[in-house]
């Protein structure tokens, strides 16, 4: 079952997510989506790294924490009730199945 | 192909406010934060803060906290530095910058072209 | 705040040189440092960031190097368009400092 997490209309909402990098900036594609995490990738990608940076994000997605040491958490600005549901982080891990999946809950009150 | 493009250059007085733009184009105005970078004459670059272009929420370096303002006008895509009670100290070139609103993503790789103000009684 | 400090303040060269600039941080910012480059009455242009990271449309002759507190642009063989004053930045702790900069003059 999915971790949930919670925060009020017109606030920021916080996601937690982190990996381990083999150093800092040895980086592991991550990406965040809005539904659960599928077999593969991310459905509806609103945040996304690779291997040197974040490369694409849309609009109120942001990370806050220090990536290049694997602190992946999204942050989500000035949420509102349609924020609300499953969102996915998948640590993109080289080789067959390796992904770490996390699916979090965000209740928006 | 992205842009930013700032106001003309400004000849003020001592006492007086001035309010340079910087108009943004060729991306989503709202994914990326604007920076404003002060550099006066023959010297190097300064940090004034920066303006999240989602919220609206400046960030001020402690040296510009006072008489400085940024603002944005979302949907021309602009953003805004407002200096106010000018002092010659203030003579220099400002520098509109793009940055991701990531807190650790801090280079800018796009810059405005500039607007030099220049304040004298 | 993070105090960068560039050297030298000046450097003289001639074309085909291989050229290094040198950034000190006052403290450890990991590879949280960004290089820019400033021709004479132009904005600053990024060249390299997150110390050692090239730019899309950046000569390949531009890289750098570093970790910690000590960092390093070199220009493998300098050409004439290369004059300007070259700047570091701390991009780890705001307000994301710059170093002085390093004016480089050709011959």
């Known amino acids: 079952s999915e971790v949930e997490y919670r925060a009020e209309v017109g606030q920021n909402a916080y996601l937690p997510c982190f990996y381990t990098p083999a150093a800092p900036g040895n980086l592991v594609p991550v990406c965040w989506g809005k539904g659960a995490c599928p077999v593969f990738e991310c459905g509806n990608v609103v945040l996304r790294t690779d291997e040197r940076d974040v490369n694409y994000w849309t609009s109120r997605y942001w990370l806050n924490g220090d990536f290049r040491k694997g602190d992946v958490s999204l942050t989500i600005e000035n949420v509102t009730l349609a924020d609300s549901g499953i969102y996915c982080c998948r640590i993109q891990i080289p080789g067959i199945m390796n992904d770490e999946k996390f699916n979090l809950k965000l209740v928006i009150k | 192909q992205i842009q930013l493009v700032q106001s003309g250059p400004e000849l003020k007085k001592p006492g007086e406010t001035v309010k340079i733009s910087c108009k943004a184009s060729?991306?989503?105005?709202?994914?990326?934060?604007m920076s404003w970078v002060k550099q006066a004459p023959g010297k190097g670059l300064k940090l004034m803060g920066w303006?999240?272009?989602?919220?609206?929420?400046?960030t001020y370096a402690d040296d510009f906290k006072g008489r400085f303002a940024f603002s944005l006008e979302t949907s021309a895509s602009a953003a805004y530095l407002q200096i106010n009670n000018l002092k010659n100290e203030d003579t220099a070139t400002y520098f509109c910058?793009?940055?991701?609103?990531?807190?650790?993503?801090?280079?800018?790789?796009?810059w405005g072209q500039g607007t030099t103000l220049t304040v004298s009684s | 705040d993070i105090v960068m400090t560039q050297s030298p303040a000046t450097l003289s060269v001639t074309p085909g040189d291989r050229v290094s600039l040198s950034c000190r941080a006052s403290?450890?910012?990991?590879?949280?440092l960004h290089w820019y480059q400033q021709k004479s009455h132009e904005s600053p242009r990024l060249l390299i960031k997150?110390?050692?990271q090239s730019i899309s449309g950046i000569p390949s002759r531009f890289s750098g190097s570093g970790s910690g507190s000590d960092f390093t642009l070199s220009i493998n063989s300098v050409e004439p368009e290369d004059v300007g004053v070259y700047y570091c930045?701390?991009?780890?702790?705001?307000?994301?400092?710059f170093g002085g900069g390093t004016k480089l003059e050709i011959k």
């Open positions: 997150y110390a050692s």
């Open positions: 060729g991306y989503t105005f709202t994914t990326y934060g």
């Open positions: 403290q450890s910012i990991s590879d949280y």
């Open positions: 303006i999240n272009t989602y919220s609206g929420a400046p």
């Open positions: 910058a793009r940055k991701p609103p990531h807190y650790y993503v801090n280079s800018f790789d796009y």
């Open positions: 930045q701390n991009g780890h702790s705001f307000p994301y400092t």
